[in-house]
């Protein structure tokens, strides 16, 4: 999916209003310095591409974040403010249902969500030069 035509300001407002709080809740009990940010993004469409990938694609050591509250809200925000996004996700959702796993918070998942927080922060500051 090409995130170029999303309403970035609305997605930012959704993040600041509620998604950010859910990410903090998920990470509660973890020091903010515990994980180094290794994933970056260069502009808002790129940030959303990375956020989608880290949130919804299973990775080694972290089978699924998709049922977490922040993930459900992320999916909803993209569906509302990225035209045509919902249609592209129907097949992906059906595939995910087939391989659904029970929710387990592993250290790898905490690291992944820490990366997500960094991507969201970057998304919210699009005019900053890349370090």
């Amino acid at each position: 999916y090409d995130f170029t035509n999303c309403d970035f300001e609305k997605i930012k407002a959704a993040y600041l209003s509620t998604i950010s709080k859910d990410l903090i809740t998920y990470m509660s009990g973890t020091k903010s310095t515990e994980f180094n940010n290794t994933v970056s993004c260069s502009n808002r469409p790129h940030c959303l591409t990375e956020i989608q990938s880290l949130t919804f694609n299973p990775t080694a050591g972290c089978a699924s974040l998709a049922k977490e509250m922040f993930a459900m809200k992320t999916k909803a925000a993209l569906a509302i403010w990225c035209p045509g996004y919902s249609e592209t996700q129907i097949n992906a959702t059906q595939a995910m249902k087939k391989r659904r796993k029970r929710k387990v918070t592993t250290n790898k998942c905490l690291e992944q969500v820490s990366q997500l927080q960094g991507l969201w922060r970057r998304f919210n500051r699009p005019l900053l030069k890349q370090q």
Epitope: A14, S17, T18, I80, W81, S86
Partner: nanobody, 132 residues
């Protein structure tokens, strides 16, 4: 230009009823999400009730469930807020607000409808005072 105009506020005794109205000019409500917010002195603006003018889906704040009803007629304009069994804590300025995408994604909007930062258009507000 785009305008939302609220009316119907006033002074009412506890247990009484009021019906607020939100009318749009300069654009049509079709497919919009219309939400009533309220703000009491010294408090944050809070979402009270949402309606999708696309499919009629409604959401309510827990504090008003069973007492308030949001609706629109077939023309979708105006949108009404019927307020029954009013309490002194319902005293506030009531605003209506419109957003262009949440109306066509009403199921996804369950997470976001009550956040004022997401709305494009706002009315000037109407005062509701409930005396004990």
């Amino acid at each position: 230009q785009v305008q939302l105009v609220e009316s119907g506020g006033g002074l009412v005794q506890a247990g009484g009823s009021l019906r607020l109205s939100c009318a749009a000019s300069g654009f049509t409500f079709d497919d919009y999400a219309i939400t009533w917010f309220r703000q009491a002195p010294g408090k944050e603006r809070e979402g009270v009730a949402y309606i999708s003018n696309n499919d009629g889906m409604t959401y309510y704040a827990d504090s008003v469930k069973g007492r308030f009803t949001i609706s629109s007629d077939n023309a979708k304009n105006p949108v009404y807020l019927q307020m029954d069994s009013l309490k002194p804590e319902d005293t506030a300025v009531y605003y209506c607000a419109a957003e262009g995408r949440m109306g066509t994604h009403s199921r996804d909007s369950v997470y976001f409808w009550a956040f004022s930062a997401l709305y494009d258009y706002w009315g000037q507000g109407t005062q509701v005072t409930v005396s004990s």
